[in-house]
Every structure is written in C-alpha cells, then in structure tokens.
C-alpha cells in the first residue's frame, strides 16, 4: 500500500472500442485513487451464444461491491454486458460467470499476450 492518493494498483487493460476512442487496445494500467478510497480492477464482456466478446478491462474506483473480492466473478443472471470487479494486481486477467441463482460456472482464460504499460 502506497502513501496518500498514490496507492498504486495495476490492472490488465483492454478496450474493444480502442480505434473509435483513440486509446491503446490492450496492456497494463496503473490506477491511482484517493487516500481514503480503495482501488479495484474490472472486466466486462458479452456472451453471444457461447462466444465470449471482451468489451473492456481496467481500473475501477472505490466500490463496495468489489471489496475483498480476490477473483473477478460476475453474478448477474443474463445481462447484456457481464461485469466483474476485484482487488489485487492483475486480478482481472481471468474472469468468471457464476450466477447467484445457480447454473454452471464458466471461467475465461485470456490468450497469452505481451502487454504494454499504460499510465
């Protein structure tokens, strides 16, 4: 844990809309928060008939829904866009869908990449 607002957490970064938004497509992202706030990583994706389409990954600011979650697990039944958040460096590399109402757990492993650092 760093000092003041500069406590740094690193997350996997990805943006499917990178060309339109003129950002990098993928890499690592350093997160900065406020002294009394927590930092998280997140992942969002779509599931079209079993095909996983990654939407975004990156830093996520102080959110009690993410507190003490070491793994990125989406619990909504069947949303348009799945979302999970977690605490811990690069905790959003792998992400899982585990509906609260029950059903099969599906974990998504990322393809191997050589990420670049975003600041």
């Amino acid at each position: 844990s760093g000092r003041g607002e500069a406590e740094t957490r690193e997350c996997i970064y990805y943006n499917a809309n990178w060309e339109l938004e003129r950002t990098n497509q993928s890499g690592l992202e350093r997160c900065e928060g406020e002294q009394d706030k927590r930092l998280h990583c997140y992942a969002s994706w779509r599931n079209s008939s079993g095909t996983i389409e990654l939407v975004k990954k990156g830093c996520w600011l102080d959110d009690f829904n993410c507190y003490d979650r070491q793994e990125c697990v989406a619990t909504e039944e069947n949303p348009q866009v799945y979302f999970c958040c977690c605490e811990g460096n690069f905790c959003n590399e792998r992400f899982t869908h585990l509906p609260e109402a029950g059903g099969p757990e599906v974990t998504y492993e990322p393809p191997p990449t050589a990420p670049t650092l975003l600041t």
């Epitope: 000092r3 003041g4 607002e5 950002t23 975004k56 996520w60 959110d63």
Partner: antibody, heavy 114, light 106 residues
Framework: VQLVESGGGLVQPGRSLRLSCAAS????????MSWVRQAPGKGLEWVAN????????HYMDSVKGRFTISRDNAKNSVYLQMNSLRAEDTAVYYC????????WGQGTQVTVSS | IQMTQSPSAMSASVGDRVTITCRAS??????LAWFQQKPGKVPKRLIY???SLQSGVPSRFSGSGSGTGFTLTITSLQPEDFATYYC?????????FGQGTKLEIK
C-alpha cells in the same frame, strides 16, 4: 477541512500574479491539491493539480508554460504562479482538496484587464 | 476527453424526479464525479466514483453509469436542489468538466 485562497486582484495583461491557498483540518502532505477556475457567468474549468510530495504536476493546455503549481508542506499551502496573464484568465480561482476535489475554498477573484 | 452534459437547462417542480446525463467522448471507467453549485456559492461534490454518495449528501441524490454514459438522479426534488450541476472526469489529463445543467423551478 478549511481552504483559504488569497492573492487575487486586478492585473494588466502580460503581468503576473501568485495565488496562495492555506489548508487546515486534514493531513495536507497526504493529498494531491488542485486549482479550478470559473469565468464570469461560465462553467467550471479544471486548471492544475500537484501530487502530495510535489513530484507530479498537471495542467490544462491553455495555461501550460504560463502557470506553475507548487506546494509547501511545511506551511500547509499550495500556490499558483500565473505569468503572462490574458483577459481570458479572468475568473474566480478555487483551491480544492485532492485530485477528486472533495472540498473547495471560497475562491479568489482574478481580473485581467488594461 | 470531452464531457457532454444534457440538458443544459431544465425546469422542474418540487417533488419531481430529475435525471441529468453526462457522456464522455471515450471510456472513463467510473472516474466521474458530480458537483452542485448554487448562485454565488462554492461548488460542492455530491457523488464520486460515478455512484458513491459523498458523506453528508442527502440520499435522494444518486449516480450511476460507467464507461461513457453517466446519470445523476434526484428522486424527490427539494427547494434547495435548484442549482447548476456539473460532471467531472478524472480518468485522464487534463481533467474536464461538463458544461453544466441549470435546474430551475417550474
């Protein structure tokens, strides 16, 4: 938390002014500090911020090279040195705590006019 | 990053539910705050991290959204809520405010 700005006033174009912000009620050397301005009848405009130890500074494009943000943690103060002032810099300048602006001072009026 | 607020002005009555939207020109995760400013007064932060309520702010205020689309909702408008509201992105430098939404009494 209390933030008190000072140093504003009427100044001619091209001249300089130094704004000060005295902070109290929180651990000053643990927080980024920011300056935000508001021109008469206009919206808010983020100007600059500085990391808690002074090692990082960021500015809006139109003030880069003219304005300098600094801080003195021993005095619990943050400063905005404004050089080569222009008419469009006329505004109320607010000092705010943190990079996310959770507390603001009352502001100090800067008027740039000949 | 450009922040576009809508509407720029609106009128409503006490007790109304009001929604103000803010759109970012690129994804900003939840790096968004909402501020309230009354005429001649200092801006006050209402919401941080898109949906977290600032301490001391009434629960009728709420924020939602992530990525590029955000909303500020006031569930039951009170007389003291008539003011100008601004969003702020602090995902990347330079930080940018929306142009403001002036909320007036109908």
């Amino acid at each position: 938390v209390q933030l008190v700005e000072s140093g504003g006033g009427l100044v001619q174009p091209g001249r300089s002014l130094r704004l000060s912000c005295a902070a109290s009620g929180f651990t000053f050397d643990s927080y980024w500090m920011s300056w935000v301005r508001q021109a008469p009848g206009k919206g808010l405009e983020w100007v600059a911020n500085i990391k808690y130890d002074g090692s990082e500074k960021h500015y809006m494009d139109s003030v880069k090279g003219r304005f300098t943000i600094s801080r003195d943690n021993a005095k619990n103060s943050v400063y905005l040195q404004m050089n080569s002032l222009r008419a469009e810099d006329t505004a109320v300048y607010y000092c705010a705590k943190g990079a996310w602006l959770d507390y603001w001072g009352q502001g100090t009026q800067v008027t740039v006019s000949s | 990053i450009q922040m576009t607020q809508s509407p720029s002005a609106m009128s409503a009555s006490v007790g109304d539910r009001v929604t103000i939207t803010c759109r970012a020109s690129q994804g900003i995760s939840n790096y968004l705050a909402w501020f309230q400013q009354k005429p001649g007064k200092v801006p006050k932060r209402l919401i941080y991290a898109a949906s977290s309520l600032q301490s001391g702010v009434p629960s009728r205020f709420s924020g939602s959204g992530s990525g590029t689309g955000f909303t500020l909702t006031i569930t039951s408008l009170q007389p003291e809520d008539f003011a100008t509201y601004y969003c702020l992105q602090h995902k990347s430098y330079p930080y940018t405010f929306g142009q403001g939404t002036k909320l007036e009494i109908k």
